[in-house]
């Protein structure tokens, strides 16, 4: 049958629309299904019917149940059912699955999170937004009309977002909260000729003899998952593994994703107990993918 699930929290406002939509001029009668008792239309009641809307101001756990709406046109009567569940407020931050609205996905280009069901309420901006129960602060977050916009979306923006607003009915204010999950999806990936972010080509780095130093080779290869992308160091044109000097070690390349979505790799060359002969070597940062090879050279000099 034409039925819709609705849910809310005790002591908050809940407004439910009849699932059987009709033209605005049609009369709508509401009943509590278990008793077939008519829902009053007088606004002085805590629970009252207002056309296509059923209002709980505020809701109580005991209001849970199935409500019948009958929409009457001059020649047709059509029935809908609203299955309402009111839950006790959660003592902790955790929002259980049964209180979650549909999950939305976002990406770098589109990161709107709409506040669920808000169109049913008489509310005024701005909305308050929370992520995993923490109030959202900072310039990346913009509460705009009935949605939240996140600038420069990153994967760690995924999580549960709660909107909180005030519903006003005849001068009385009621709180409403609604939570939905937000997931971040990768934009369509692509690969580019490698771009080395560091070091600059023909750079010179000053070092202290006898000290340790690190050289970082950082290169980006495009967006999204990359089929082939390697970053490595060479000494005088030779692989580190072929250069028999235990003081000089190359770390495994670390994948890194920046807020702009670029797929980058960092590889660190660690030189322990810098010696005079290390200043004579040519250190090449190599970035390789299917498009080709890019090389930046760096040398060491005494401080």
């Amino acid at each position: 049958k034409f039925s819709k699930q609705s849910w809310g929290l005790e002591n908050e406002a809940l407004i439910v629309r009849c699932p059987r939509q009709g033209k605005s001029s049609y009369i709508v009668d509401w009943y509590y299904s278990q008793t077939n008792k008519s829902i009053p239309t007088q606004e002085r009641n805590r629970v009252f019917a207002s056309g296509q809307l059923l209002k709980f101001l505020p809701a109580e756990v005991a209001d849970s149940g199935i409500y019948t709406c009958i929409v009457r046109s001059p020649t047709f009567n059509r029935t809908g059912y609203a299955n309402v569940t009111i839950y006790k407020k959660q003592p902790d931050c955790n929002v259980p699955d049964y209180l979650m609205y549909s999950t939305v996905s976002g990406s770098e280009k589109n990161s709107k999170i709409y506040c669920p069901t808000i169109d049913l309420y008489n509310w005024t901006a701005p909305l308050e937004w929370f992520k995993n129960c923490q109030a959202l602060q900072g310039s990346r977050y913009k509460a705009h009309k009935s949605f939240l916009v996140i600038d420069n979306v990153m994967t760690d923006d995924a999580g549960d977002y709660t909107c909180k607003f005030i519903h006003n009915e005849n001068g009385a204010n009621y709180s409403v909260t609604a939570t939905r999950s937000f997931t971040v999806k990768d934009e369509q990936g692509f690969s580019l000729f490698p771009v080395i972010r560091a070091p600059a080509h023909n750079e010179t780095k000053e070092v202290e003899i006898g000290e340790n130093t690190n050289l970082t080779c950082s290169a980006c290869f495009g967006k999204g998952a990359q089929f082939l992308a390697t970053v490595q160091w060479q000494l005088n044109g030779n692989k580190i593994t072929d250069f028999s000097e235990p003081r000089i070690q190359q770390e495994e390349g670390q994948n890194q994703s920046f807020s702009n979505g670029l797929a980058c790799v960092n590889t660190v060359l660690r030189i322990a107990d810098v010696k005079e002969e290390d200043l004579l070597l040519r250190y090449d940062c190599l970035a390789l993918n299917l498009h080709g090879l890019r090389r930046h050279t760096i040398r060491l000099s005494r401080k």
């Epitope: 049958k1 034409f2 939509q21 009709g22 033209k23 046109s73 020649t75 047709f76 059509r78 029935t79």
Partner: antibody
Framework: EVQLLESGGGLVQPGGSLRLSCAAS????????MIWVRQAPGKGLEWVST????????SYADSVKGRFTISRDNSKNTLYLQMNSLRAEDTAVYYC????????????????WGQGTLVTVSS | EIVLTQSPATLSLSPGERATLSCRAS??????LAWYQQKPGQAPRLLIY???NRATGIPARFSGSGSGTDFTLTISSLEPEDFAVYYC?????????FGQGTKVEIK
Amino acid sequence: EVQLLESGGGLVQPGGSLRLSCAASGFTFSIYDMIWVRQAPGKGLEWVSTIRGEGGGTSYADSVKGRFTISRDNSKNTLYLQMNSLRAEDTAVYYCARDPWSTEGSFFVLDYWGQGTLVTVSS
Amino acid sequence: EIVLTQSPATLSLSPGERATLSCRASQSVDDDLAWYQQKPGQAPRLLIYDASNRATGIPARFSGSGSGTDFTLTISSLEPEDFAVYYCQQYITAPLTFGQGTKVEIK
């Protein structure tokens, strides 16, 4: 009393054009969705096209898309179906009908129908 | 599109007998299903809407039942004027589709 009266049917050659009209009376025409349904001789009913009352949005069956155009003139309480590039398989009785309920994006039954007008496509 | 299959194609019965017509949808239409009656040379006439509600002016001998994919139109006791073709129609989604019809004829 609600009445729908189709006109404009007739014999037309393949590739030709025809414009059907449906004059409505007895109800507030402008707020209702209106529909064309056709019935080939000895066959069943086939939805052809819908035009919304509020907003005037249109939709078409795949079999007529790009060839037929539904329109309405609310000031004249009249529904139209412009049929171009007619084919033999378009031969049918064309009925206009009223959807008494539907809201944007939804559909309902057809509670009033005209008596139909016969379109014959033949060389 | 949603395909509606009606059975039987023809039903041969005598006045006073009970007629049971079936309509099966290729996917769920909830209760968004209607039944129409059509007599030769006439336009269809709405009998049942929302699967089980009688339209205004339709005699109580016509009843509809079902939900989801299986629906039934029952005429409890056939009157002479009930011999006609009956169509089911779904309106849950575009395009609106009709069944191919069941002809109820006099035995």
